[in-house]
């Protein structure tokens, strides 16, 4: 059960309620574990993880990425700018996580867990950011057409897209985790 979704610590019946910071930290680590499992299936199924042709597929994608201006790195750190970027980035990743839903055979449940846990994480972070400026959400129509476009790709491009989404999402979450530990 993902942390934050009524998980019960069986070994510790007297567990205190998780603090906001702990919930966020645990949620990100839970999602990262899920991504690792999905990457394992992707890499076992195809040679995408060793491919040098990633640039071809990346042209079709506009995956969220941390940049210096986002204030999430040690150099130029800005906690408010960074938190907005993390939430905005996660919201932008949602369409790509939806795309992943039909891309796995043995890890179908894991793909769903990553998607649902990300939604929960966004809620946690929005609570943390309640005093910050409004966060812009992606346009549903744009997302729908992007999803259609991605699903219409040939098999090789779909495999590469899956690999790139997982890799980018992992990198984004790792950067987010490091930054959030300071907040």
């Amino acid at each position: 059960v993902p942390p934050g979704e009524d998980s019960k610590d069986v070994a510790a019946p007297h567990r205190q309620p998780l603090t906001s910071s702990e919930r966020i930290d645990k949620q990100i680590r839970y999602i990262l574990d899920g991504i690792s499992a999905l990457r394992k299936e992707t890499c076992n199924k195809s040679n995408m993880c060793e491919s040098s042709k990633e640039a071809l597929a990346e042209n079709n994608l506009n995956l969220p990425k941390m940049a210096e201006k986002d204030g999430c790195f040690q150099s130029g750190f800005n906690e408010e700018t960074c938190l907005v970027k993390i939430i905005t980035g996660l919201l932008e990743f949602e369409v790509y996580l939806e795309y992943l839903q039909n891309r796995f055979e043995s890890s179908e449940e894991q793909a769903r867990a990553v998607q649902m846990s990300t939604k929960v994480l966004i809620q946690f972070l929005q609570k943390k950011a309640k005093n910050l400026d409004a966060i812009t959400t992606p346009d549903p129509t744009t997302n729908a057409s992007l999803l259609t476009k991605l699903q219409a790709q040939n098999q090789w491009l779909q495999d590469m897209t899956t690999h790139l989404i997982l890799r980018s999402f992992k990198e984004f979450l790792q950067s987010s985790l490091r930054a959030l530990r300071q907040m």
Partner: antibody
């Protein structure tokens, strides 16, 4: 050299106030969260409070919530602990500590400043 | 709050000895740290996130464990290692510390 220097400790009567300072040098102050940890004479360590790098988020132990306030002046690379309604049990050496970037570890510590609450 | 219990509270050892200090948490913790403190000095970070060696710390120090049980090991005790050692955990706020283990010269 990376350094944290605490000051502002001293003798204060119960119910009184004191403001501790923690001056940072040798590193860029802005990306790091800071904490205060105290140690009563001959006793163990007790975490008191944390502040995020820009001061947007603060966390306090139950023992000091409502009495202590953690703040920053980033232009001076200095952290402050405003201590009000002081009690005898607040008597301790107060250390400020810098959090390791990307982790929760308290990595760099100052030499400490002694606060004595007594009538 | 999460309680940390260190054992032993104190120990006597000789230079070259292998020393093991344990830290038991009242419930499962997310991250564990170990500190060394000498009289009149500030604590010094030795180990972070259970087993990572802090910058500048000799490799004779190592940390292990997960869940509720953690260990600090000094593989070969050196004269400068006689001090008090504290475990500290983070699983959300507050951070909490163990009561300390004093390592003395036999």
């Amino acid at each position: 050299e990376v350094q944290l220097v605490e000051s502002g400790g001293g003798l204060v009567q119960p119910g009184g106030s004191l403001r501790l300072s923690c001056a940072a040098s040798g590193f860029t102050f802005s990306p790091f969260a800071m904490s205060w940890v105290r140690q009563a004479p001959g006793k163990g360590l007790e975490w008191v409070a944390k502040i995020s790098p820009g001061g947007s988020w603060t966390y306090y132990s139950d023992t000091v919530t409502g009495r202590f306030t953690f703040s920053l002046d980033t232009s001076k690379s200095t952290a402050y602990l405003q201590m009000n309604s002081l009690r005898a049990e607040d008597t301790a050496v107060y250390y400020c500590a810098r959090q390791l970037w990307g982790y929760y570890a308290l990595e760099i510590w100052g030499q400490g400043t002694l606060v004595t609450v007594s009538s | 709050d999460i309680q940390l219990t260190q054992s032993p509270s104190s120990l006597s050892a000789s230079v070259g000895d292998r020393v093991t200090i344990t830290c038991s948490a009242s419930i499962s913790v997310s991250y564990m740290y170990w500190y060394q403190q000498k009289p009149g000095k500030a604590p010094k970070l030795l180990i972070y996130d259970m087993s990572n060696l802090a910058s500048g710390v000799p490799s004779r120090f190592s940390g292990s464990g997960s869940g509720t049980d953690f260990t600090l090991t000094i593989s070969s005790l050196q004269p400068e290692d006689f001090a008090t050692y504290y475990c500290m955990q983070w699983s959300g706020y507050p951070y909490t510390f163990g009561q300390g283990t004093k390592v003395e010269i036999k």
